[in-house]
Interface confidence: medium
């Protein structure tokens, strides 16, 4: 299953990055799971994961660093709390969980660049 | 003449970006000219230019936004005062001016990403 996501995104100076993950659904899925993975130096880490029923809101874990909304086959993902050391390739993985058959799609990744802000001068 | 430069550089939160421009000199040039060009939306603009004698410092114009140092066939370039809207492809152009023959090399460009910092809160 094909998954599309932008090649490059810049995090804001507040450490927030948003991108769209779009999948070409071969069937009429009602339950979809979206996972964001970070790949850097050949190491892959899960950033966050959410399950949603088509037409409903994404449900992330209770203290996820991601938020998101869904619209049809598009998922708008926002990652918060990013630091310069988090610069890397963020891969969108989409699973069509229900009804069968199960489908899996993995995007090529979005390179997210993060720059730490300069500290503000002390106010004396 | 081959010119190498990094594919991507992030400007610091102070709007400063540095990268190395390296050229494969076919001869023993004594006078070299380095020009930085910015390409965005198919429009090319000169950012700065410097001429230097091998073994000496680069001489930019006195109000140039660039500074740099040279070491052999490598030029270390720094561009200052960058804003988010300056994000673009920065191309290094190297000309071997003297002695003849004249050689020209153009790099593939360095994509410089710039994020404007958040304003600091007012100190009351």
């Amino acid at each position: 299953m094909h998954v599309a996501q932008p090649a490059v995104v810049l995090a804001s100076s507040r450490g927030i990055a948003s991108f769209v993950c779009e999948y070409a659904s071969p069937g009429k899925a009602t339950e979809v799971r979206v996972t964001v993975l970070r790949q850097a130096d050949s190491q892959v880490t899960e950033v966050c994961a959410a399950t949603y029923m088509m037409g409903n809101e994404l449900t992330f874990l209770d203290d996820s660093i991601c938020t998101g909304t869904s619209s049809g086959n598009q998922v708008n993902l926002t990652i918060q709390g990013l630091r310069a050391m988090d610069t890397g390739l963020y891969i969108c993985k989409v699973e069509l969980m229900y009804p069968p058959p199960y489908y899996l799609g993995i995007g090529n990744g979005t390179q997210i660049y993060v720059i730490d802000p300069e500290p503000c001068p002390d106010s004396d | 003449m081959h010119v190498a430069q990094p594919a991507v550089v992030l400007a610091s939160s102070r709007g400063i970006a540095s990268f190395v421009c390296e050229y494969a000199s076919p001869g023993k040039a004594t006078e070299v000219r380095v020009t930085v060009l910015r390409q965005a939306d198919s429009q090319v603009t000169e950012v700065c230019a410097a001429t230097y004698m091998m073994g000496n410092e680069l001489t930019f114009l006195d109000d140039s936004i660039c500074t740099g140092t040279s070491s052999g066939n490598q030029v270390n370039l720094t561009i200052q005062g960058l804003r988010a809207m300056d994000t673009g492809l920065y191309i290094c152009k190297v000309e071997l001016m003297y002695p003849p023959p004249y050689y020209l090399g153009i790099g593939n460009g360095t994509q410089i990403y710039v994020i404007d910092p958040e304003p600091c809160p007012d100190s009351d």
Partner: nanobody, 126 residues
């Protein structure tokens, strides 16, 4: 391989305090700094329950029963997770486990955590 080792458990009177520590090894600095970590507890015959978790950005979540009494903290230099337990009650008696996820985000479900310590016993008497 990631390994977690708890310490600091013991017996204490109700109203007393204990500080649990969990030393992590097998991590790169970056992976430790960004991994969700937490404390769970279990009493015989009951399911493991979340006590407190801390995610990559330092956001913490506590079980309702420990809010205001327990504090979770993470030392990214020493690669150590702590749980400061104050105003202990007899119902806090349990085996306390340190846990980690291969994720920046946490979960209340113990099954989502892939790495576990051996546990340290906390006993609170009235």
């Amino acid at each position: 391989q990631v390994q977690l080792q708890e310490s600091g458990g013991g017996s204490v009177q109700a109203g007393g305090s204990l500080k649990l520590s969990c030393a992590a090894s097998g991590y790169t600095d970056y992976t430790y700094n960004t991994s969700c970590m937490g404390w769970f507890r279990q009493t015989p015959g009951k399911e493991r329950e979340r006590v407190a978790t801390v995610n990559k950005v330092g956001s913490t979540i506590y079980a309702d029963s420990v809010k205001g009494r327990f504090t979770i903290s993470k030392d990214n230099v020493k690669n150590t997770l702590y749980l400061q337990m104050n105003s202990l009650k007899p119902e806090d008696t349990a085996m306390y486990y340190c846990a980690a996820r291969g994720s920046w985000s946490c979960s209340q479900f113990w099954g989502d955590f892939g790495y576990w310590g051996q546990g340290t016993q906390v006993t609170v008497s009235s």
